[in-house]
Interface confidence: low
């Protein structure tokens, strides 16, 4: 029996379409596939950012694949051809690997890139990113922010910069249509007459950086002689009630501090008739069903009760 062999794919390359980290990996079929005309060959593709411990691996019949990468680091990828079992009498036949790399030649020293980049998606409506200028850069240095997510034809530049001392230190984004639950890519580059400025790349998903508004309309309701129900309403905005978790801080008579994390807009508190004063505040966060992460809102305005009225049915501010 002659050993069945197959060549690796040809012209394997990583192409940067200018989407700030979303790259195309593409290749051509191997040479001398004439023997396997009846077979649809497959390709096993492995890729990672240089320095990462783990490879991502996919098997595809296509001649291209797309994914997001961290352009602050290089990218390495390798691919080989796999012949399906029905073409090889059940034996596993694969080619040698074809390998390629890609990186953006860095300009400037690392200290010149922006520092402390921070992006918050306020109330799932308004994205704001802020940063500090690089270490030791001169006032003539200016930074520019570009962004892209799937659905945009090309990367867009920020049109509403936040400035300090004439330098861009942040960006207020416009309405971002259909931009959540997908990777959001940002590049902040810079220019200076004196020295080159290092670019920085960031990737996140908007639903994971949401900071909601605080809850509103805090009220007390007497449930029984020893129970008081604390209630509040979800903040105004597009976030549905099912997406919230809440944290409550309750202070009784300036001594006992109770904290609790709850899922609904109510909390029942055990009290005694001796309670003279009750105060509580609530904050909100997007929960595990709607995001993988999130930022707590600010605390709500404090709602307090003082005096005899605790024995009455409903207690409002």
């Amino acid at each position: 029996d002659t050993e069945i062999k197959v060549n690796p794919p040809q012209d394997f390359e990583i192409v940067d379409p200018g989407y700030l980290g979303y790259l195309y990996l593409q290749w051509q079929p191997p040479l001398s596939l004439d023997h396997f005309k009846e077979c649809t060959v497959e390709y096993e593709l492995k890729y990672r950012n240089i320095g990462s411990e783990t490879w991502k691996t996919i098997i595809t019949k296509n001649l291209h694949y797309k994914d997001g990468f961290d352009l602050n680091k290089g990218i390495e990828a390798k691919i080989h051809t796999l012949l399906p079992w029905q073409c090889t009498n059940g034996s596993e036949v694969q080619s040698s690997w074809a390998e390629t790399t890609y990186w953006i030649s860095p300009q400037g020293i690392p200290e010149t890139k922006v520092q402390d980049m921070d992006c918050v998606y306020y109330n799932w409506q308004y994205l704001l990113c802020s940063w500090k200028p690089g270490i030791g850069v001169l006032l003539d240095t200016n930074y520019n922010l570009f962004y892209w997510y799937e659905g945009l034809d090309h990367a867009l530049q920020c049109v509403d910069y936040i400035k300090a001392d004439g330098q861009n230190i942040g960006c207020r984004f416009p309405y971002l249509e259909a931009s959540d639950y997908k990777d959001f890519y940002i590049c902040v580059n810079g220019s200076s007459e004196n020295k080159p400025i290092r670019s920085s790349y960031f990737t996140f998903q908007l639903q994971n950086i949401v900071k909601p508004l605080p809850p509103v309309y805090l009220t007390f309701t007497r449930e029984s002689s020893c129970e008081i129900k604390l209630k509040w309403s979800i903040p105004l905005g597009p976030i549905p009630a099912r997406c919230f978790d809440y944290e409550i801080e309750i202070r009784e008579d300036d001594t006992t501090l109770v904290t609790a994390t709850v899922e609904n807009e109510t909390y029942t508190l055990k009290t005694t008739n001796e309670t003279r004063q009750l105060c509580f505040v609530v904050r909100s966060k997007v929960n595990i069903y709607c995001s993988d992460d999130g930022i707590w809102s600010e605390w709500s305005d404090k709602q307090c009760w003082e005096g005899e009225d605790l024995s009455k049915k409903t207690l409002l501010r």
Epitope: D245, T261, V262, E263, N287, I288, D292, D293, G294
Partner: antibody, heavy 119, light 107 residues
């Protein structure tokens, strides 16, 4: 993406202890509860306890109080579950899982660690 | 602790069948019930939470209903990949407790 990667299978003798690790990635480790759940062969799932790495708060199933100890190492984003005074009925697959609050189900699970208690 | 009693413990069924599994809580758990799918040697996978909400990416053939103490999980048309064990869990109080599981087997 969120990942929980557990340590490998363990064999222990009755009366001994075992320590299983669960390394988290892809989210803010200190912001979410990590729950430990076990499954004996052919049996249902059973909660052991949970830890909140942000402040090392723990919540134990009464059945495991005193025998299970949950700890978290923020520097490595790793949670540990130590079970002592092992007996044969502790033979099970032990899972770590991520919730948000204590009263949430678990969308993210580790791959499981088989602990076999045998003399 | 709240007990979750699941039935049946096993079910022989065929591709295309409608499958219904029930879970009964030992006390009122409002709508705080989740359902998981588990295949041999694999971790459980969350399908339904809060009795009737499908988790992200779960096909709409899976559904859940119920409140109080009685809960139902339904697969409207069984697919080959659905043969697995399904478990309910109450997420109303600590500790979380699970039903004993229902194993779907090919008839």
């Amino acid at each position: 993406q969120v990942q929980l990667v557990q340590s490998g299978a363990e064999v222990a003798k009755p009366g001994a202890s075992v320590k299983v690790s669960c390394k988290a990635s892809g989210y803010t480790f200190t912001s979410y509860w990590t729950q430990w759940i076990r499954q004996a062969p052919g049996q249902g799932l059973e909660g052991i306890g949970a830890i909140y790495p942000g402040d090392d708060d723990t919540s134990y199933n009464q059945k495991f109080k005193g025998r299970a100890t949950l700890t978290a190492d923020k520097s490595t984003s790793t949670v540990y579950m130590q079970l002592s005074s092992l007996r044969s009925e502790d033979t099970a697959v032990y899972y770590c899982a991520r919730g948000a609050t204590l009263l949430r189900p678990f969308p993210y699970w580790g791959q499981g660690t088989l602990v076999t208690v045998s003399s | 602790d709240i007990q979750m009693t699941q039935s049946p413990s096993s079910l022989s069924t065929s591709v295309g069948d409608r499958v219904t599994i029930t879970c009964k809580a030992s006390q009122d758990v409002s709508t705080a019930v989740a359902w998981y799918q588990q295949k041999p040697g694999k971790s459980p996978k969350l399908l339904i939470y809060s009795a009737s909400y499908r988790y992200t990416g779960v096909p709409d053939r899976f559904s859940g209903s119920g409140s109080g103490t009685d809960f139902t999980f339904t697969i409207s048309s069984l697919q080959p990949e659905d043969f697995a064990t399904y478990s309910c869990q109450q997420h109303y109080s600590i500790p979380p407790t699970f039903g004993g599981g229902t194993k779907l087997e090919i008839k």
